[in-house]
């Protein structure tokens, strides 16, 4: 089920998610799940042919983020 934004944001800001802080939003299946069920994207080695792990996720709150703010993963920092 789609929801309208909770607040006006810049074009590049992550969209809010309907999850409580205890869960994360899975962009692939578009619903909330336990954060441990998601896999963070990792850099793919050159020439690797195996499928990448599940990605596309939005933790509902990052450390220091306000309630209701979504935090996008930062693959380059993992």
């Amino acid at each position: 089920m789609r929801r309208g934004p909770r607040s006006l944001r810049g074009r590049d800001a992550p969209a809010p998610t309907p999850c409580v802080p205890a869960e994360c939003f899975d962009l692939l299946v578009r619903h909330c799940v336990a954060c441990g069920l998601l896999r963070t994207p990792r850099p793919k080695p050159a020439g690797a042919s195996s499928p990448a792990p599940r990605t596309a996720l939005q933790p509902q709150e990052s450390v220091g983020a306000g309630a209701g703010e979504a935090a996008l993963p930062l693959p380059g920092l993992l």
Epitope: R3, S62, A65
Partner: antibody, heavy 118, light 113 residues
Framework: EVQLVESGGGLVQPGGSLRLSCAAS????????VSWVRQAPGKGLEWVGF??????????EYNPSVKGRFTISRDTSKNTLYLQMNSLRAEDTAVYYC?????????WGQGTLVTVSS | DIQMTQSPSSLSASVGDRVTITCKSS????????????LAWYQQKPGKAPKLLIY???TRESGVPSRFSGSGSGTDFTLTISSLQPEDFATYYC?????????FGQGTKVEIK
């Protein structure tokens, strides 16, 4: 103020059914996740499951120990949640709590005792 | 399922003592994308419902006294009561909500010495 009040506990025979209620006040159940947790007499806590909010289609998650026997639902007009328990076993004897889920299990009711015995 | 192991299972302490309870999980509870550990601590007094003290391993719930603190990351966590008060004698539980089913430690009973 958030308040949760459980009711419906009692004595039931093995194989029987019981429906527990969790009356919520201070918040709308349409916009909240609510969990059920149980505690056998003198034992620790065991998570039963939870129901998500309206934005998530009231989807549910269950502990494998109760999946297929227990069902969580809600009546938004009464701002009440339910735990339907079928095929009850002696090991289901416990105090059953409902709790609002936000950052963890944030607010808890006082619990209702379910005894499964012949 | 993730197993949560608390130690000790019980302890005796006096008012004013510093008390430390540990909790180990069978797998990491750290979600690397936001650096949150999905671990909570609860206090339960006899005949009462549990009360949330700490979430995300180290964030104190609103209204919880500052003498309660949580620390740790990954698989090893600690709840510390810096100066035990008479109202702190209770059973304490850790709980993971990193994945389903949510699981609790077996509890640590803090008794009066």
């Amino acid at each position: 103020e958030v308040q949760l009040v459980e009711s419906g506990g009692g004595l039931v025979q093995p194989g029987g059914s019981l429906r527990l209620s969790c009356a919520a006040s201070g918040f709308p159940v349409t916009g909240s996740y609510v969990s059920w947790v149980r505690q056998a007499p003198g034992k620790g806590l065991e998570w039963v499951g939870f129901i998500r909010d309206k934005a998530n289609g009231y989807t549910t998650e269950y502990n494998p120990s109760v999946k297929g026997r227990f069902t969580i639902s809600r009546d938004t007009s009464k701002n009440t949640l339910y735990l339907q328990m079928n095929s009850l076993r002696a090991e289901d004897t416990a105090v059953y709590y409902c709790a609002q889920v936000r950052r963890a299990l944030d607010y808890w009711g006082q619990g209702t005792l379910v005894t499964v015995s012949s | 399922d993730i197993q949560m192991t608390q130690s000790p299972s019980s302890l005796s302490a006096s008012v004013g003592d510093r008390v430390t309870i540990t909790c180990k999980s069978s797998q990491s509870l750290l979600y690397s994308s936001n650096q949150n550990n999905y671990l909570a601590w609860y206090q339960q007094k006899p005949g009462k419902a549990p009360k949330l003290l700490i979430y995300w391993a180290s964030t104190r719930e609103s209204g919880v006294p500052s003498r309660f603190s949580g620390s740790g990351s990954g698989t090893d966590f600690t709840l510390t009561i810096s100066s035990l008060q008479p109202e702190d004698f209770a059973t304490y539980y850790c709980q993971q909500y990193y994945t389903y089913p949510y699981t609790f430690g077996q509890g640590t009973k803090v008794e009066i010495k």
